[in-house]
């Protein structure tokens, strides 16, 4: 339910004895009260009251969820993947219905050479985890397969996803024109045929932190912004301190609303602070400023 | 589990004729692949020759002509003619049996491996 809260004022004193004055509520935004029972727990933007506090939903907090926090948790994936279906011809072997059947002593076979030879293929590429046979079919041996590929998250790893494809494109076009087979003879652990080699579709890891941070903040989306630290995206807003896009207030305090960060000045006993930064000084006795 | 165990290796004269066996535990393979390869000392395994359930058969360049490999399915049993042999066909002379109709002579390619037997041809 829709509820009127009257709007106090909240009076914060610094460590050097000086007081902010704010509007606890932003008066031109609709609160949403959670009432349990005869208990109204005044839990605002869709937090609920658990019979001891307010559990608010991200990004807020405080007592009555009316804060928004500085920071909000993301986690990108530990691992990125990406997966390339492939097809390739294999001369060395004939086709047999028992290769239909995946738990046929044939398949088992197959399955173990293949996974041998394509090991071998891309033994060079570090984000090979391995293949994964789909289907076999006739014309000697026609095998579709997955090609795995994993690397660690990183803001790049779209780059080295698609850098690793490509060599995997690269080493079967090779192994698949080098091994083949001379006078109805392999002499190699498989032979192929050069013009069967086909790569259907890769699909890779789609994580984009900065939608992740965006689909977070919800109305505040516009405000918040990624920035990295250690390979690391943190999903933050201006009012959260070391970071490029950090507001600096001063003399003041920083706080997010829905029209973005804004800087509450400190009044000391002996200056009002003013100014968007809350930078420009006057002085009280003698009404001088300092910049 | 599948057995496999070669044997009739000796010793033979250059120019001498020797014929080797391989005995299959059961006729699992009668429907994929047997074959024959040999290991000189000192030297890699290499094939020697190969027979498929389709009828296919395949020799090593350096024993074509002299050497014919044969299968005797009602006796789960592998064959290897050597005729005109000659110093360098002296080595261990293994069987090797696959599921797969294959067409390889390479031994990686092959999963099941029987006991060798010696060969040494010598004046």
């Known amino acids: 339910p829709l509820a009127t809260i009257p709007v106090s004022t909240t009076s914060l004193t610094s460590s050097e004895g000086s007081t902010i004055s704010t509007p606890s509520v932003d008066i031109s935004t609709p609160v949403t009260t959670s009432i349990v029972g005869d208990q109204c727990s005044r839990c605002k933007n869709g937090g609920f009251w658990d019979g001891l506090k307010c559990q608010c939903l991200t990004p807020y907090y405080g007592e009555s969820c009316e804060e928004v926090v500085n920071s909000i948790d993301i986690a990108p994936p530990e691992t990125v993947s990406a997966q390339m279906e492939l097809t390739v011809t294999v001369t060395s072997v004939k086709f047999t219905d028992e290769l239909k059947n995946h738990s046929s002593q044939e398949f088992r076979e197959f399955n173990k050479t293949f996974t041998e030879q394509m090991n071998i293929v891309y033994s060079g590429i570090p984000e090979y985890v391995g293949v994964n046979i789909t289907n076999l079919r006739l014309g000697s041996v026609v095998v579709e397969h997955d090609v795995l590929l994993r690397t660690k998250y990183t803001p790049e790893y779209k780059t080295a996803l698609d850098n690793a494809t490509e060599v995997v494109k690269q080493k079967i076009t090779k192994v698949t024109t080098e091994q083949i087979m001379t006078n109805d003879n392999c002499s190699a652990l498989m032979c192929f045929n050069t013009t069967g080699t086909q790569v259907q579709n890769i699909t890779v890891t789609q994580y984009d932190p900065v939608e992740e941070c965006r689909q977070k903040a919800e109305e505040y989306e516009d405000y918040f912004l990624v920035e990295y630290r250690d390979q690391k995206p943190y999903c933050i807003s201006p009012c959260e301190s070391g970071f490029n896009a950090s507001k600096n207030c001063n003399h003041g305090k920083c706080q997010m609303s829905q029209n973005g960060a804004r800087c509450l000045c400190v009044t000391t006993e002996t200056h009002w602070y003013s100014g968007e930064d809350c930078n420009q000084g006057t002085q009280k006795s003698h009404h001088h400023h300092h910049h | 589990d599948v057995q496999l165990q070669a044997s009739g290796g000796g010793l033979v004269q250059p120019g001498g004729s020797l014929r080797l066996s391989c005995a299959a535990s059961?006729?699992?393979?009668?429907?994929?692949?047997m074959s024959w390869f040999r290991q000189a000392p000192g030297k890699e395994r290499e094939g020697v020759a190969i027979?498929?359930?389709?009828?296919?058969?395949g020799y090593a360049d350096s024993v074509k002509g002299r050497f014919t490999i044969s299968q005797d399915n009602a006796k789960n049993s592998l064959y290897l003619q050597m005729n005109s042999l000659r110093a360098e066909d002296t080595a261990v002379y293994y069987c090797?049996?696959?599921?797969?109709?294959?067409?390889?002579?390479?031994?990686?390619?092959?999963?099941?491996w029987g006991q060798g037997t010696m060969v040494t041809v010598s004046s």
């Open positions: 059961d006729n699992t393979f009668s429907r994929g692949s």
């Open positions: 090797a049996a696959s599921f797969l109709v294959l067409r390889a002579l390479n031994p990686k390619a092959w999963h099941y």
């Open positions: 027979i498929s359930s389709d009828g296919w058969t």
